[in-house]
């Protein structure tokens, strides 16, 4: 028997520095977690103690903090090289800055193979990008070899900006021939490493003949055997065992997100490459693990540029941006409109001639808007200003919901109206009319939504049984502010871009902004 230790991360999302327990900015260092310096300490400790170790990343290193905003992926290549990752799969967020924003900072600079078997380049891009990422790589580990085959969510064109010259094929269809190719090379220990979410990970384990282990990402899935060490609730045991169609037991793993945990899986193979046993658990990277001094020093050196960036002008406003709780928790506020417009703008994807865009709607809890921005400071808007408006380090995500769920959400928005509570919704691509004289749960008297399957966008009444795409904060997707119906009834959830980054990009693009209060939210006469 031969034993392999797989160390794995996924959905790190730009958390190069240590974070608080909820993966936001570290405030009290003695209680902070994660970060590449701490990760390196643990990785090195395991590398010294165990003979056959692979360090793998399942994608979405890009996007999530000011580190990515400023360094645009160069930080990912630099620190992943420093940690000596063995391989990485491409995630959807690796395409957030377009193909060029992937090629130059990461693909050309990484000293480790970057993998995806189901992304095929066509047209002029084919010769430019070919070879910069690989479908698979065979890695020597001790006296053995291990094949790693990569995959990426086929939803990427709807979630990011890969352009029109990359085709995202079905994962299973694309993986099988590459695994077969590895088999012809007599590679009998094969790991599928990818970024399509836990459900697809399980399907790959079930359907792709020859895959021995699946290391996944995208769904931020936390798996754990025993008592979990922090706040995350396990979605299942670690590893999660799937019985393949040909009768093999295939371990599937994921390690939550944001570099908070290091996935740790030990696999025992027989001489024919069959998995005999698998066990392990994610390791919580808490403050009991010291940060590596040399990596930490490097982080501090790279940090300097971030501090300078946060005070630079992104654009100007010529109107007061009303982000006060007195406005945003009671009525339509222009800061809410600005943020929602930025959220929709960030999700413009012309992927189908029938649709002007795949999504037109935004909802945003008023309680998530934490500060106004005064235009009387020469109109200047900085990252620092936006960090005061959106201080929680969240993301603006894409969900699919039935009309009936949206109706419940809007009823919840005003179920206890008047108490300055955070659940009052700001909107984009939606016209809502409330009658507060009616009883809670029956106050939405009109709810019109902007069409997507149209050449001239117009507002149509919400249909209860129709499925709609909506952009919203991850806080709401996870049921925050009492929006349990969203969490319970959502049909799909894909995590998106960092909230501040979305708004800052929009402001930089527009240069001068003047959002108005324009009748998106109305109250029927006599009730307000």
């Amino acid at each position: 028997a031969w034993e392999l230790t797989i160390l794995h991360t996924n959905d790190v999302h730009s958390r190069l520095e240590q974070t608080s327990e909820d993966s936001s900015k570290c405030v009290n260092a003695s209680r902070c977690m994660g970060g590449v310096a701490r990760l390196f300490t643990k990785v090195q400790q395991i590398r010294r103690a165990e003979p056959n170790v692979l360090l793998l990343d399942a994608g979405d290193q890009y996007q999530g903090t000011i580190w990515f905003t400023v360094y645009k992926g160069a930080e990912v290549a630099h620190f992943m090289n420093a940690l000596r990752y063995d391989a990485m799969a491409l995630g959807n967020h690796e395409f957030d800055n377009g193909v060029e924003g992937l090629i130059e900072p990461l693909l050309k600079e990484a000293k480790f193979p970057i993998l995806s078997a189901n992304i095929k380049a066509k047209g002029p891009l084919a010769s430019q990008i070919s070879g910069l990422y690989l479908p698979y790589k065979v890695l020597p580990v001790g006296d053995e070899v291990v094949g790693i085959v990569g995959y990426t969510s086929k939803e990427t064109p709807f979630l990011s900006n890969p352009g029109t010259n990359l085709v995202f094929e079905d994962e299973i269809t694309a993986l099988q021939p590459e695994v077969d190719k590895l088999k012809t090379l007599n590679v009998n220990k094969i790991i599928a490493l990818g970024h399509s979410g836990f459900e697809m990970d399980k399907l790959i384990a079930q359907k792709v003949r020859g895959v021995d282990v699946v290391v996944g990402g995208h769904s931020n899935t936390f798996l754990y055997t025993g008592n979990p060490p922090s706040k995350e609730v396990p979605a299942g045991k670690y590893p999660f065992i799937v019985t393949s169609d040909d009768g093999r037991k295939v371990p599937v793993v994921q390690a939550y997100a944001f570099g908070k945990y290091l996935g740790y899986l030990k696999i025992e193979f027989d001489e024919r490459g069959n998995v005999i046993s698998s066990h392990g658990n994610p390791i919580l990277l808490n403050s009991s693990i010291p940060e590596d001094p040399s990596i930490k020093a490097d982080i501090n050196k790279w940090r300097i540029k971030l501090d300078n960036y946060s005070t630079q002008e992104l654009g100007k406003t010529i109107v007061y941006l009303d982000g006060s709780s007195q406005s945003c928790r009671f009525r339509e506020c222009n800061m809410g409109n600005l943020i929602c417009d930025a959220m929709i703008n960030n999700n413009l994807r012309h992927t189908d001639e029938m649709f002007w865009n795949h999504v037109s709607m935004c909802i945003l809890n008023g309680g998530g808007i934490r500060s106004p921005i005064d235009e009387r400071n020469n109109g200047t808007i900085t990252w620092e200003n936006l960090a005061a408006v959106l201080p929680f380090g969240g993301t603006f995500d894409l969900v699919q919901l039935k009309g009936s769920t949206l109706k419940k959400a809007f009823e919840h928005s005003v179920h206890r109206y008047g108490q300055s509570t955070g659940e009052f919704l700001q909107v984009g691509g939606i016209h809502v009319v409330y009658d507060l004289s009616r009883k809670p749960g029956d106050r939405v008297v009109k709810l019109d939504v902007l069409c997507t399957k149209c050449r001239v966008p117009s507002y149509d009444p919400l249909k209860m049984d129709e499925v709609y795409k909506v952009i919203l904060p991850n806080f709401l997707a996870n049921g925050g502010d009492g929006f349990q119906m969203i969490k319970d009834e959502l049909l799909r959830h894909d995590s998106g871009d960092q909230d501040i980054n979305v708004v800052s990009t929009y402001i930089s693009k527009m240069k001068v902004i003047y959002p108005a209060v324009e009748g998106r939210i109305k109250f029927s006469t006599g009730s307000h």
């Epitope: 020597p140 580990v141 053995e144 070899v145 094949g147």
Partner: antibody, heavy 117, light 107 residues
Framework: EVQLVQSGAEVKKPGESLKISCKAS????????INWVRQMPGKGLEWMGR????????NYAGKFKDQVTISADKSISTAYLQWSSLKASDTAMYYC??????????WGQGTLVTVSS | DIQMTQSPSSLSASVGDRVTITCRAS??????LNWYQQKPGKAPKLLIY???RLHSGVPSRFSGSGSGTDFTFTISSLQPEDIATYYC?????????FGQGTKVEIK
Amino acid sequence: EVQLVQSGAEVKKPGESLKISCKASGYAFSSSWINWVRQMPGKGLEWMGRIYPRAGDTNYAGKFKDQVTISADKSISTAYLQWSSLKASDTAMYYCASLLDYSMDYWGQGTLVTVSS
Amino acid sequence: DIQMTQSPSSLSASVGDRVTITCRASQDISNYLNWYQQKPGKAPKLLIYYTSRLHSGVPSRFSGSGSGTDFTFTISSLQPEDIATYYCQQGNTLPLTFGQGTKVEIK
């Protein structure tokens, strides 16, 4: 450091047999393919065949199929190329090269075989 | 068998020049195309695999591109130590096959 060290030059007569060797070190010999490549004087490279030492699996190019035998002894990390009856046209430089996935990453220094009466 | 055709068969260029060699496969080989350098009296060395990936330790002045049947190998600024014969090789299908080689000389 990966190294492939080949046996020394050979001068043989037509009809004689010959076995040349390629000893590997610094990597997982048993788990990667050893390829043999011929280069006739003043000519280009020709792939002859390959062996997977752990299982003994072999593949040959059509023109070399019944002309040579490729074998390996994984206990001493050595691959072999042999002829049972040499011809003058077998005069060439022979290289071994290891292949893990896409390409022949590492090459031996070559063994010059001269067949002359 | 897949035929690999390289052009030109030889070229002469000055130090600092950009040098381009092309390789055409008789059928689609996806990106399974490698480039090797062979200096006089020496064994071949891998430069580029899977169309454009630089093998470890290979200078960045060497690059590759292409897809399907047409591939290009470039030396961005020719150095005296680059005098050699360069071979393309397809790894898509057995038997593995090489181009006939391109001899690069200094003017």
